[in-house]
Interface confidence: low
Amino acid sequence: DSSKWVFEHPETLYAWEGACVWIPCTYRALDGDLESFILFHNPEYNKNTSKFDGTRLYESTKDGKVPSEQKRVQFLGDKNKNCTLSIHPVHLNDSGQLGLRMESKTEKWMERIHLNVSERPFPPHIQLPPEIQESQEVTLTCLLNFSCYGYPIQLQWLLEGVPMRQAAVTSTSLTIKSVFTRSELKFSPQWSHHGKIVTCQLQDADGKFLSNDTVQLNVKHTPKLEIKVTPSDAIVREGDSVTMTCEVSSSNPEYTTVSWLKDGTSLKKQNTFTLNLREVTKDQSGKYCCQVSNDVGPGRSEEVFLQVQYAPEPSTVQILHSPAVEGSQVEFLCMSLANPLPTNYTWYHNGKEMQGRTEEKVHIPKILPWHAGTYSCVAENILGTGQRGPGAELDVQYPPKKVTTVIQNPMPIREGDTVTLSCNYNSSNPSVTRYEWKPHGAWEEPSLGVLKIQNVGWDNTTIACAACNSWCSWASPVALNVQYAPRDVRVRKIKPLSEIHSGNSVSLQCDFSSSHPKEVQFFWEKNGRLLGKESQLNFDSISPEDAGSYSCWVNNSIGQTASKAWTLEVLYAPRRLRVSMSPGDQVMEGKSATLTCESDANPPVSHYTWFDWNNQSLPYHSQKLRLEPVKVQHSGAYWCQGTNSVGKGRSPLSTLTVYYSPETIGRR
């Protein structure tokens, strides 16, 4: 049943003498494995023998016999699926029909494949897109119906016989559907490629030429133009004539229209290849080009810049920057339309020519107030001198100048006075808008630039003001020189350094912290009595009677100031001791008698000692000696001794008389 055999392979294979043929082939024998395979060249069926006659190129049988031809022809298939064949090398006489005789256990089949072997390598075929336009990428394809594993080939692209720089992509196909080698080249043709020859060259593995195909490029492009101008530099003066000529160097297809453009705008009624401009004016300066169109589109020439020369126009001045700050830099630019550009400039400041300034720009590195004013300029080129324009105003701004603080009061100023100061300045730009004062205080500013200090303090030494516009300028501080009575008057003991003892030399100093004016007088006072008029009060030998409350006064022309009262304390040993008796120096026995040791001492007596008429000390140490009851034997002379931290003092003797009572007299 022949329907059981299914084959797939290319219908015809192409090769050339000495190359090789690779025949991709698959089959399916549904009733079992292949048992016998014979490759015939131009097989003919013999009805008599019921067998095929023809040249046997390959034979694979059960007994394994292989003809000598098998070295050239190889069956690369298997027993159930693959029937791929290779003939290497292939010869011209291999052209014709190849017959694959297949036999399985029960079935037979003859499959025919066409083989076309040429004497020489056949050329590849170049495929081009239907239309090629400049700068549009196209793909050029070179196709060759050949590929064989045993015979490597390459396809190379040439432009006018020179290898093309663009990288080509080569692909091969060796499948049951098709056998080919293909090279694809992406290429952006330019107008200059029009008419050029492109070649696809077939080469062997060593780069040896085998065959080729050529095509001529038909690149559609806009007209390519050249513009020529008389005079050639396109520089003329007003009133001259200019001729421009447009030449078409290439156009595909042929051009249809011509026009001229100035600054991108079409010139009316100018549709020939020559543009004549007679008696040109400066307004005709500009970029000229010609435009020629074809079916692809318009082409433009390079632009010619026509320069119509003229004398400078009235100039204007541009200032960078106004207003300018004093000390900053300023640049002036003289602007004047002229062709050619001006070569010389004359500058004016407030109508007066500025010497040595001949450039387009004037640079002043450090602006001063006197630079303010109107700046104008005149431009000059080879055709003449322009007119001076209106000029530009430079405003120079600066902080207030020569600021001074002025005291309005009559001098001298006394503590407690109301002081008025004004802040004055010489000049300012912009105007002064505010004032500042140092130091800050709760002071009045009755009007701009005036300061009123009520009840001025003795310590208000200096005041400074600043006049402010955009900046503040400070005046030098002004001294108020406030006059005041002496301050902080106090009594200070100079000597001795320790406490004052009776008999010491003592010096007291009248101190004060400050006085304005400095000339002063001193007064010492004790208990309202004037003691001296020096800064010091001296005691050669102090006595307890000098103790008391002292004050000093310091006078200047403004007033006088007293110190706080200062207490002078004199330390001395007990003195003026005496023994007093109570109720008297005659006491009746049995009564009570009290002896008191009286003294004058500073500090007070801290310790008392009592003595009798025998200078015998008694065991009593308090100020009072109490005898109760008093006896006649107590009669006699007594004295006491007082002690303090300074020393000791003793009293004179005092006699106590104790007389008998009536009872005692009565008993006798």
Epitope: D263, K287, G299, R300, S301, E302, E303, F305
Partner: nanobody, 124 residues
Framework: QVQLVESGGGLVQPGGSLRLSCAAS???????MGWFRQAPGKEREFVAG????????YYADSVKGRFTISGDNAKNTTYLQMNSLKPEDTAVYYC??????????????????WGQGTQVTVSS
């Protein structure tokens, strides 16, 4: 007075895009406009140029395929579209104009007018 004013610069991450514009003010003429750049401590180098007559463009090898120069001759404006930006593109970008035809478009000395420059920083 001719003035060229650039805009569009700024900070962008690597791989990002920016579009620079350059507007020419005043009544004047030009043959071509170009973009140059100057990185810190390096010389000013050509980036791209455009010839108005046929919109022909020119590029430095380092920016080919990433930068595109275009323009509007009627408005005297040129644009530089910068894609796939790299840290080495960091520079001050200057716009320049050829008032008269002076030949090669990648030579600084052939340009008559220059802008003040716009900073382009490419950093993550």
């Amino acid at each position: 007075q001719v003035q060229l004013v650039e805009s569009g610069g700024g900070l962008v991450q690597p791989g990002g895009s920016l579009r620079l514009s350059c507007a020419a003010s005043g009544s004047w003429f030009n043959i071509a406009m170009g973009w140059f750049r100057q990185a810190p401590g390096k010389e000013r180098e050509f980036v791209a140029g455009i010839r108005w007559s046929d919109s022909k463009t020119y590029y430095a090898d380092s920016v080919k395929g990433r930068f595109t120069i275009s323009g509007d001759n009627a408005k005297n404006t040129t644009y530089l579209q910068m894609n796939s930006l790299k840290p080495e593109d960091t520079a001050v970008y200057y716009c320049a104009a050829q008032r008269y035809y002076r030949g090669s478009y990648n030579r600084q000395t052939n340009y008559d007018h220059w802008g003040q420059g716009t900073q382009v920083t490419v950093s993550s």
